[in-house]
């Protein structure tokens, strides 16, 4: 572990209350194929415990969705991954809109510091799928 | 190699017969930029040879496709990556539908064990592109 | 550094002149969360300085885009990542079309050699977003 191979892969637990756009995550072998090895969860949000450059990746699929579903709703459905705390480091790292699709998936390299908490904000009014092969979020430490 | 840096990047060889939704892969420098360093191919399916957490990634593009192609077909075109053998470990790891798009691309971290064979099932009646820059599938061992 | 952990994450600087489909990138902490640790930029194009297998990833979002924007334009908007120099190694590594979406994102493993310059060609007449959470391009050395 001293090599700094911090890594986590999370599955969706639930969405937040109406005014809270954050997705709440869970992880652990008992839940399926999700795990936390280094990073930790704080009220469903992922907290980094080791400084470094991380590969952050995410896939979110909307529930009961067809190519026309997203066009039925007035507000665009957008997923943003960012550092939400500490407030001094708050920034959006990765952002995608669904448009006429039902799934977004992406990844990026970004420096993260111990104590950074990552939030995944799903704006719009569509419920994401909780299937573990359709919606997941993970980080992988890749170098100091 | 003892570090466990198992890695593979594959290109599409062919689709299966009509009732077989699996994509059949190939790899090796003679074929282009695909390679297998650790994992192996068993009848076009990728077999893992070392336990660990892997980053699995895939991109599949449909052949002769426009944004209307996928909507013309009644059956949704879906790509699922999963462990197909041994049967006791069979599970879907990653799933995406094309909807009104012609390409899906995603990645995830997942624990895999020696002997796990990964299958990539393309359901629907649309043919995937065999261009090596449009359709590819790979795994990378990232930690024990 | 001797471990060969070459890595870079870039943000969009600007597009090329009318007949030049290349995207021009920039990187460095002063610019935000982009960085170059090993690879270098040559006139906005990424040059590799160490042989090995790399994970290449990209996300490009079109500016002022809705699901109908891309369908309004006659020429399909396509993003291709490839080796553009040296000419002897010129090849397309990864290619995606936007179709009715506004964002493409993908990743792949590929062998790269010292001196390879990667180009990201955006064909079509739509302007990409320069927002750093919407458009980015990166490489990560993963093994010799």
């Amino acid at each position: 572990e001293s090599l700094g191979w911090d890594i986590a892969e999370l599955q969706l637990n639930h969405t937040g209350p109406q005014q809270d756009p954050r997705l709440y995550w869970q992880g652990g072998p008992a839940l399926g194929r999700s795990f936390l090895r280094g990073p930790e969860l704080d009220k469903g949000q992922l907290r980094i415990r080791r400084d470094g450059i991380y590969m952050v990746h995410i896939q979110v699929t909307l529930a009961i969705c067809s190519s026309t579903s997203t066009s039925r709703h007035h507000h665009p459905t957008t997923l943003a991954v960012g550092i939400c705390s500490p407030a001094s480091r708050s920034i959006s790292l990765l952002r995608l809109s669904f448009h006429q699709g039902c799934t977004i998936a992406s990844q990026r390299l970004t420096p993260l510091a111990r104590g950074d908490t990552l939030c995944t904000n799903l704006t719009g009014t569509l419920l994401p799928s909780r299937n573990t092969d359709e919606t997941f979020f993970g980080v992988q430490w890749v170098r100091p | 190699e003892s570090l466990g840096w198992d890695i593979a990047e594959l290109q599409l060889n062919h689709t299966g017969p009509q009732q077989d939704p699996r994509l059949y892969w190939q790899g090796g420098p003679a074929l282009g930029r695909s390679f297998l360093r650790g994992p192996e191919l068993d009848k076009g399916q990728l077999r893992i040879r070392r336990d660990g957490i892997y980053m699995v990634h895939i991109q599949v593009t449909l052949a002769i496709c426009s944004s209307t192609s996928t909507s013309r077909h009644h059956h949704p075109t879906t790509l699922a990556v999963g462990i197909c053998s041994p049967a006791s470990r069979s599970i879907s790891l990653l799933r995406l539908s094309f909807h009104q798009g012609c390409t899906i691309a995603s990645q995830r971290l997942t624990p895999l064990a020696r002997g796990d064979t990964l299958c990539t099932n393309l359901t629907g009646t649309l043919l995937p592109s065999r261009n090596t820059d449009e359709t590819f599938f790979g795994v990378q061992w990232v930690r024990p | 550094e001797s471990l060969g952990w070459d890595i870079a994450e870039l943000q969009l600087n600007h597009t090329g002149p009318q007949q030049d489909p290349r995207l021009y990138w920039q990187g460095g902490p002063a610019l935000g969360r982009s960085f170059l640790r090993g690879p270098e930029l040559d006139k906005g194009q990424l040059r590799i300085r160490r042989d090995g297998i790399y994970m290449v990833h990209i996300q490009v979002t079109l500016a002022i885009c809705s699901s109908t924007s891309t369908s309004r334009h006659h020429h399909p908007t396509t993003l291709a990542v490839g080796i553009c120099s040296p000419a002897s190694r010129s090849i397309s590594l990864l290619r995606l079309s936007f179709h009715q979406g506004c964002t493409i994102a993908s990743q792949r493993l590929t062998p790269l050699a010292r001196g390879d310059t990667l180009c990201t060609n955006l064909t079509g007449t739509l302007l990409p977003s320069r927002n750093t959470d919407e458009t980015f391009f990166g490489v990560q050395w993963v093994r010799p």
Epitope: L12, I64, H73, H74, L126, L127, P128 | - | -
Partner: antibody
């Protein structure tokens, strides 16, 4: 406070059209979808159709040929029109707001309903 | 169309006891990690009122004595302890696919 109020004719002649207006307050039609449901002693509760926040509509296939739903966002009104009514269309007609989650399709607020009798 | 069959059609439960109402779907209404089944209460002369959504989520303002469970094709609404004001007809509704359909209703009487 969220409210929906239907206003309709009460009595409709057989083969004629039924028009109902649903006036809403406490929420915006640009954010929420509105469903139409009817209730009769013979058939219980029947979902008829929905108009989404964008104005796109979905209808129960059994009614698609004779049903249209439209709206005026600025007036906070949804309009329901069903053609060729017969006696078995006699029912209470409700408009109902879709739940906050657009793809959940539960109905969290309902109008009081308007009673429609089809008779000559 | 998905047919929802409720049972029993009516039941009488003593004050303070448990009322259990069943709803069976002709095919699974579970997908995407949720069960798209909802429960409503309707009193005479009033519109239906949403009690439970996604099989087990209590709608805001609904008393905690109401609970829902189930997945796939079999769902249950429980009321415990039953109170006088719970006398009503209860309906299940699915939203797995179009058209959305309702169960035939279960009339609850308090003894």
């Amino acid at each position: 406070e969220v409210q929906l109020q239907e206003s309709g004719p009460g009595l409709v002649q057989p083969s004629q059209s039924l028009s109902i207006t649903c006036t809403v307050s406490g929420f915006s039609l640009t954010t929420y979808a509105v469903h139409w449901v009817r209730q009769s002693p013979g058939k219980g509760l029947e979902w008829l159709g929905v108009i989404w926040s964008t104005g796109i509509t979905d209808y129960n296939a059994d009614f698609i040929s004779r049903l249209s739903i439209s709206k005026d966002n600025s007036k906070s009104q949804v309009f329901f029109k069903m053609d060729s009514l017969q006696s078995d269309d006699t029912a209470i007609y409700f408009c109902a707001r879709n739940h906050y989650y657009g793809n959940l399709n539960a109905m969290d607020y309902w109008g009081q309903g308007t009673s429609v009798t089809v008779s000559s | 169309d998905i047919v929802l069959t409720q049972s029993p059609a009516s039941l009488a439960v003593s004050l303070g006891q448990r009322a259990t109402i069943s709803c069976r779907a002709s095919k699974s209404v579970s997908t995407s990690g949720y069960s798209f089944m909802h429960w409503y209460q309707q009193k005479p002369g009033q519109p239906p009122k949403l009690l439970i959504y996604l099989a087990s989520n209590l709608e805001s303002g609904v008393p905690a004595r109401f609970s829902g469970s189930g997945s796939g094709t079999d769902f249950t609404l429980n009321i415990h302890p039953v109170e006088e004001e719970d006398a009503a007809t209860y309906y299940c509704q699915h939203s797995r696919e179009l058209p959305y359909t309702f169960g035939g209703g279960t009339k609850l009487e308090i003894k």
